[in-house]
């Protein structure tokens, strides 16, 4: 059922999440700025083709427009989301020593994000049985494969917390 | 409510490996990420790494990337650190801290578990 | 990797007296989100650290208001306003801006 914003959310699980959302955007954009300084990768339209051939996907929100926003839907798809970038951030490991210490606080702040959503689902009543199982991930074969995954995954995250944030603003509006 | 309990006290010889456990109950442990800390006698704490149970990803202080081996089992709710090459300078009590954000960080310890390396 | 460090290591407080505890980190611990990621753990003789303080200034469950926590990006202070025989033990701040976490050295706080 669509529900405005008025919803049963606390207002204290809201704000941890825009805090999150805005923390890991820091992250996001920290590894965007380096795999730019230091491999000239700066812009995410130029590797469209080679993500499709990399096959990175997306994760949808479709459930979460905030005229007909569904909060289960919502919930989960915000989770499940946030478990696919757990996994392809994963497949980025060892990208690079510089670009390392970086990643790993993104992965960690994505896991934690992915664990306050899980949590005000189960208090809800809405938490799946059990976690759903990690899709196929992307095979990098080259470090430069790897570097451009980079780019990619980083753009489509931020591309994802954004409309996460606009979701949970509408949300958190009295 | 959220209880980590740790397995026991180890004496091992150097040059030995060592496995200490850390089940935890009263929360859906998938969850979760799992943290290791070192404190060795008389100094303070270290943060060693975690397990994301979830997706099986472990993460490591550079310093420990060679000591240490983080896994978890979420059918039995248990997360392991394995020691591996013991030294004397591995004697220290181990504990496992429960993730999370804001005041989840860190909210629920283990117990510790003693490991002491001596010939 | 991100250095924190406290003063004093070992600070005797007469009970009902106030006490203070310092500690600086060597790269601010605000994000740009508004948070300050500074952490303030007790480890009381014999036990497992708990945790006092998250975010800078927010008191955790169950800890008494007399314990308060302030500070900029870098410079944190931890107050007990009249300190009671139970608050001895090793305190600790800690960040978790940024892996890997990193803790203070401990301020070990006793009874006159």
């Known amino acids: 059922t669509p529900l405005g914003p008025a919803s049963s959310l606390p207002q204290s699980f809201l704000l941890k999440c825009l805090e999150q959302v805005r923390k890991i955007q820091g992250d996001g954009a920290a590894l965007q700025e380096k795999l730019c300084a230091t491999y000239k990768l700066c812009h995410p339209e130029e590797l469209v083709l080679l993500g499709h051939s990399l096959g990175i996907p997306w994760a949808p929100l479709s459930s979460c427009p905030s005229q007909a926003l569904q909060l289960a839907g919502c919930l989960s798809q915000l989770h499940s989301g946030l478990f696919l970038y757990q996994g392809l951030l994963q497949a980025l490991e060892g990208i690079s020593p510089e670009l390392g210490p970086t990643l790993d606080t993104l992965q960690l702040d994505v896991a934690d994000f992915a664990t306050t959503i899980w949590q005000q689902m189960e208090e809800l009543g809405m938490a799946p049985a059990l976690q759903p199982t990690q899709g196929a991930m992307p095979a990098f074969a080259s470090a430069f494969q790897r570097r451009a995954g980079g780019v990619l995954v980083a753009s489509h995250l931020q591309s994802f917390l954004e409309v996460s944030y606009r979701v949970l603003r509408h949300l958190a509006q009295p | 409510q959220v209880h980590l309990v740790q397995s026991g006290a180890e004496v091992k010889k150097p040059g030995a490996s060592v496995k200490v456990s850390c089940k935890a109950s009263g929360y859906t442990f998938p969850i979760y990420t799992m943290h290791w800390i070192k404190q060795a006698p008389g100094q303070g704490l270290e943060w060693i790494g975690y397990i994301n149970p979830s997706i099986g990803y472990a993460n490591y202080n550079q310093k420990f990337r060679d000591k240490a081996t983080l896994t978890a089992d979420k059918s039995t709710s248990t997360a392991y650190m394995e020691l591996s090459s013991l030294r004397s300078e591995d004697t220290a009590v181990y504990y496992c801290a429960r993730g999370g954000y804001g005041d989840s960080l860190f909210a629920y310890w283990g117990q510790g578990t003693l490991v002491t390396v001596s010939s | 990797d991100i250095v924190m460090t406290q003063s004093p290591l070992s600070l005797p407080v007469t009970p009902g007296e106030p006490a203070s505890i310092s500690c600086r980190s060597s790269?601010?611990?605000?994000?740009?989100?508004?948070?300050?990621?500074l952490y303030w753990y007790l480890q009381k003789p014999g036990q497992s650290p708990q945790l006092l303080i998250y975010q800078m200034s927010n008191l955790a469950s169950g800890v008494p208001d007399r314990f308060s926590s302030s500070g900029s990006g870098t410079d944190f202070t931890l107050k007990i306003s009249r300190v009671e025989a139970e608050d001895v033990g090793v305190y600790y701040c800690a960040q978790n801006l940024e892996l890997p976490y990193t803790f203070g050295q401990g301020t070990k706080l006793e009874i006159k």
């Open positions: 790269k601010s611990l605000l994000h740009s989100n508004g948070i300050t990621y």
